[in-house]
């Protein structure tokens, strides 16, 4: 039950996180005009990954896309790439995790297959979250650098325009959305990986009986979930004291998660 809850919660948290990453990527407010210590203007500038916008005090908002690829800063391109990779990985992860959910029965899918899919989706969520956090952090660093370097005629905009009035940009709402969303996706991924450890069929516990292998010559299949980290292979010949009562044949008759990696 706890495993199902952990897996379900991991899925939901990751889903929210990925939705947040998509939202952040699409948002226009990655950087916003710094209003502190500046003359009060009747115009408010803000910029996203795909376009820059100007909101006049009249209420009229005008946005212009960056219709060039080569003319854009490499850092901006890198941020775009990181966010897109994060979204793609997250979307694939969501697709995989739907089929991996313990509460959803698809044909005669083995629990071990579900465990592997859960692990795969978990890793995808972790990488997705890291991509988003990295992308947002790179952009934030770019903003901080430009903020302190900005002078009257310095190029700081995304669209390659010369500034005649010093317009300094600070963190926009999208950065915070991105950081939070990336963190949620990461947490969701970790939860999926934790759930994976409890999903494998070896986890069936018969607490009344303890089975011990006789001798040291018996080679066990790697990946006893209580004996290893769950991510690496346990290749040494050793006893697995996991409280599970099973024969050697039983252990070998089930494919472990490492057979799928």
């Amino acid at each position: 039950m706890a495993v199902t809850a952990c897996q379900g919660l991991g899925f939901v948290v990751s889903l929210i996180g990925i939705a947040g990453i998509i939202a952040a990527t699409c948002m226009d407010q990655w950087s916003t005009q710094d209003l502190y210590n500046n003359p009060v203007t009747a115009v408010f500038n803000y910029q996203g990954l795909w376009r820059s916008c100007v909101r006049e005090s009249s209420g009229f908002t005008e946005c212009r896309g960056y219709f060039t690829l080569l003319g854009l800063p490499a850092m901006l391109q890198a941020v775009r790439a990181l966010m897109i990779v994060g979204i793609v990985l997250g979307a694939i992860g969501l697709l995989v995790s739907i089929f991996a959910l313990k509460c959803i029965r698809i044909g005669s899918m083995e629990d071990s297959a579900k465990a592997n899919m859960t692990l795969t989706s978990g890793i995808m969520f972790i990488v997705s979250g890291l991509c988003a956090i990295a992308g947002v952090s790179v952009f934030a660093n770019m903003l901080v650098t430009n903020f302190w370097m900005s002078t009257a005629n310095m190029y700081t905009g995304m669209g390659g325009m010369v500034q005649t009035v010093q317009t300094r940009y600070t963190f926009g709402a999208a950065l915070f959305v991105g950081w939070v969303a990336g963190g949620l996706t990461l947490i969701g991924g970790v939860m999926m990986c934790i759930a994976c450890r409890g999903l494998a069929p070896e986890e069936t516990n018969y607490k009344a009986v303890s089975y011990h292998a006789s001798g040291h010559s018996v080679a066990y299949k790697p990946g006893g979930f209580k004996a290893s980290t769950g991510f690496g292979s346990n290749t040494k010949n050793k006893k697995i004291y996991d409280g599970g009562a099973r024969t050697e044949d039983e252990v070998q008759s089930y494919p472990s998660k490492h057979d799928y990696v």
Partner: antibody
């Protein structure tokens, strides 16, 4: 047809108060940024105050603390509450709508405020 | 505050001739975000409220005759009437629409020579 009609002007003594109103027809004032602009007799135009979305207000330094711009969405009206009036506040007061480029595209006919003892 | 200075204060031009009014701001009115200059030109005839002619320094308001044109960028702007008509006799104002307070120029009175 869009129409802005100012009212509430008149003769007032220095230190007195007046409340100017601007009623809109053919236009929903609450959806636009609105401004008050004044023109002293025989002089040029002078921006006085603006109210933008979210109720954010801006004032000319010389009227800050004395004048208050507001609006009543239900009555589709814009107001300028003028307190501690001075002789230099004597002018025709216009209300106008801000539009593209923050430019004032629709103007009322104006209401005359005379501050004199 | 931004100071808007118009020149000349008054201008006498013959009908059919070109009239040029200049406006200089004490700070650049060019917004880097959209590369637009936040300057507006108004026409005011006696006893009437002002009428918007040009916004964003060079965009003509709908319904304004095409003999009116605006140009300039940054701090220097120009309103040009290519062929003066009798109905163009009025006072012309430029306005800073970028920085608060939204200051006006002192006005240029256009007369017939």
């Amino acid at each position: 047809e869009v129409q802005l009609v100012e009212s509430g002007g008149g003769l007032v003594q220095p230190g007195g108060s007046l409340r100017l109103s601007c009623a809109g027809s053919g236009i929903t004032l609450s959806t636009y940024a609105m401004s008050w602009v004044r023109q002293a007799p025989g002089k040029g135009l002078e921006w006085v105050s603006s109210i933008i979305s979210g109720g954010i207000t801006y004032y000319l330094d010389s009227v800050k603390g004395r004048f208050t711009i507001s609006r009543d969405n239900a009555k589709n009206s814009l107001y300028l509450q003028m307190n501690s009036l001075r002789a230099e506040d004597t002018a025709v007061y216009y209300c106008a709508r801000k539009y593209h480029g923050n430019a004032l595209d629709y103007w009322g006919q104006g209401t005359l405020v005379t501050v004199s003892s | 505050d931004i100071v808007m200075t118009q020149s000349p204060d008054s201008l006498a031009v013959s009908l059919g001739e070109r009239a040029t009014i200049n406006c200089k701001s004490s700070q650049s009115l060019l917004n880097s975000g959209n590369q637009r200059n936040y300057l507006t030109w108004y026409q005011q005839k006696p006893g009437q409220p002002p009428k918007k002619l040009i916004y964003w320094a060079s965009t003509r308001e709908s319904g304004v005759p095409d003999r009116f044109s605006g140009s300039g960028s940054g701090t220097d702007f120009t309103l040009t009437i290519s062929s003066l008509q009798a109905e163009d006799l009025a006072v012309y104002y430029c306005q800073n629409n970028y920085f608060y307070p939204l200051t006006f120029g002192q006005g240029t009175k256009l007369e017939i020579k």
